[in-house]
Interface confidence: medium
């Protein structure tokens, strides 16, 4: 049995994450009327390297057979939405590309790729840019998120 919970994530500037097209997440500020456009994640607690401050999770989109995954594209670690077989996912032993180390710092969360250590789910300061995998090496990109629970 894999344990999951449903949640929404916002970046440190309170930008929400929305699905753009079929396979891309973007971060933007939403007003009250269109807050329902935010994606709801199904966060599953999976096997991986565990410590008290790093918890392995997989991030699926609720109601869709899509999971965030980390792959090498053009010699660079890249975040993508990957379609999966709904009869087999989520599972405890998720392939490493689907696994993120959830790191809690006070009330903020970071999501480090298990496949590519020190690369994090990131958003740009700029509105309506894709969510991506960044290595936060001195740049302006945002890697901290807040989590809001959603009733299952």
């Amino acid at each position: 049995a894999v344990r999951s919970l449903h949640c929404r994530l916002q970046d440190a500037q309170q930008k929400s994450l929305v699905l753009s097209g079929t396979y891309e997440l973007k971060a933007l500020h939403l007003n009250a009327e269109n807050l329902n456009q935010q994606v709801v994640f199904s966060m599953s607690f999976v096997q991986g390297e565990e410590s008290n401050d790093k918890i392995p999770v997989a991030l699926g989109l609720r109601g869709k057979n899509l999971y965030l995954s980390c792959v090498m594209k053009d010699d660079k670690p890249t975040l993508q939405l990957e379609s999966v077989d709904p009869n087999r996912y989520p599972k405890k032993k998720m392939e490493k590309r689907f696994v993120f180390n959830k790191i809690e710092i006070k009330d903020k969360l970071e999501f480090e790729s298990a496949q590519f250590p020190n690369w994090y789910i990131s958003t740009s300061q700029t509105e309506y840019m894709p969510v991506f995998l960044g290595n936060n090496s001195g740049g302006q990109d945002l890697i901290d998120f807040s989590m809001e629970f959603v009733s299952s």
Partner: antibody, heavy 120, light 107 residues
Framework: QVQLVQSGAEVKKPGASVKVSCKVS????????IEWVRQAPGKGLEWIGE????????NYNEKFKGKATITADTSTDTAYMELSSLRSEDTAVYYC?????????????WGQGTLVTVSA | DIKMTQSPSSMYASLGERVTITCKAS??????LSWFQQKPGKSPKTLIY???RLVDGVPSRFSGSASGQDYSLTISSLQYEDMGIYYC?????????FGGGTKLEIK
């Protein structure tokens, strides 16, 4: 530090109900599962069920469905377990516990226990 | 339900002795296993979760291991304060189930 403080001992008549509370401090209440466990006199431990206060997700042991009702109040950081239609075999110490390190990593902290005695 | 068969049910050991308690799971529990210590009239105290991770403040003489579906708790050098009842717990599948307990007494 993390603390779980439970309500005091109760003596109830058969057929009555009782509501045990578990007040949590020292961590973000909404984020971690609260477990309920019972221990009959001289016996081992038995898992009743759990709740994730942040969204009200509840999982019960089938054996306790209809007997135990688990709730949580995030405004007071308190979890509750109500036991209904009490019988003498419900006499036990009831514990709350929390999976503090995260959702699947083990019961880490425990309340002091609440003794519920069912006696005519 | 997953059955956790714990052995021995009781044992005597001498101070300084190495002590091992085992739990056998009736099916695969993916290493989702904790160990607890309980003293008379007290709440259980969590020693280990996820087979071998020690809870903060638990002495390093306690350790956990697994071999297939057999899980072990070892106390490397028994101390007087270690006497009590020890329980294992699987929390892989609902309903979570505890072992029957091992009463450890000082010889």
């Amino acid at each position: 530090q993390v603390q779980l403080v439970q309500s005091g001992a109760e003596v109830k008549k058969p057929g009555a109900s009782v509501k045990v509370s578990c007040k949590v401090s020292g961590y973000t209440f909404s984020r971690y599962w609260i477990e309920w466990v019972r221990q009959a006199p001289g016996k081992g431990l038995e898992w009743i069920g759990e709740i994730l206060p942040g969204n009200g997700n509840i999982n019960y042991n089938e054996k306790f469905k209809g007997k135990a009702t688990i709730t949580a109040d995030t405004s007071t950081d308190t979890a509750y377990m109500e036991l209904s239609s009490l019988r003498s075999e419900d006499t036990a110490v009831y514990y709350c516990s929390t999976i503090y390190y995260d959702y699947d990593q083990g019961f880490t902290y425990w309340g002091q226990g609440t003794l519920v005695t069912v006696s005519a | 339900d997953i059955k956790m068969t714990q052995s021995p049910s009781s044992m005597y050991a001498s101070l300084g002795e190495r002590v091992t308690i085992t739990c056998k799971a009736s099916q695969d529990i993916d290493r989702y296993l904790s160990w607890f210590q309980q003293k008379p009239g007290k709440s259980p105290k969590t020693l280990i979760y996820r087979v071998k991770r020690l809870v903060d403040g638990v002495p390093s003489r306690f350790s956990g291991s697994a071999s297939g579906q057999d899980y072990s708790l070892t106390i490397s050098s028994l101390q007087y304060e270690d006497m009590g009842i020890y329980y294992c717990l699987q929390y892989d599948e609902f309903p979570y189930t505890f072992g029957g307990g091992t009463k450890l007494e000082i010889k």
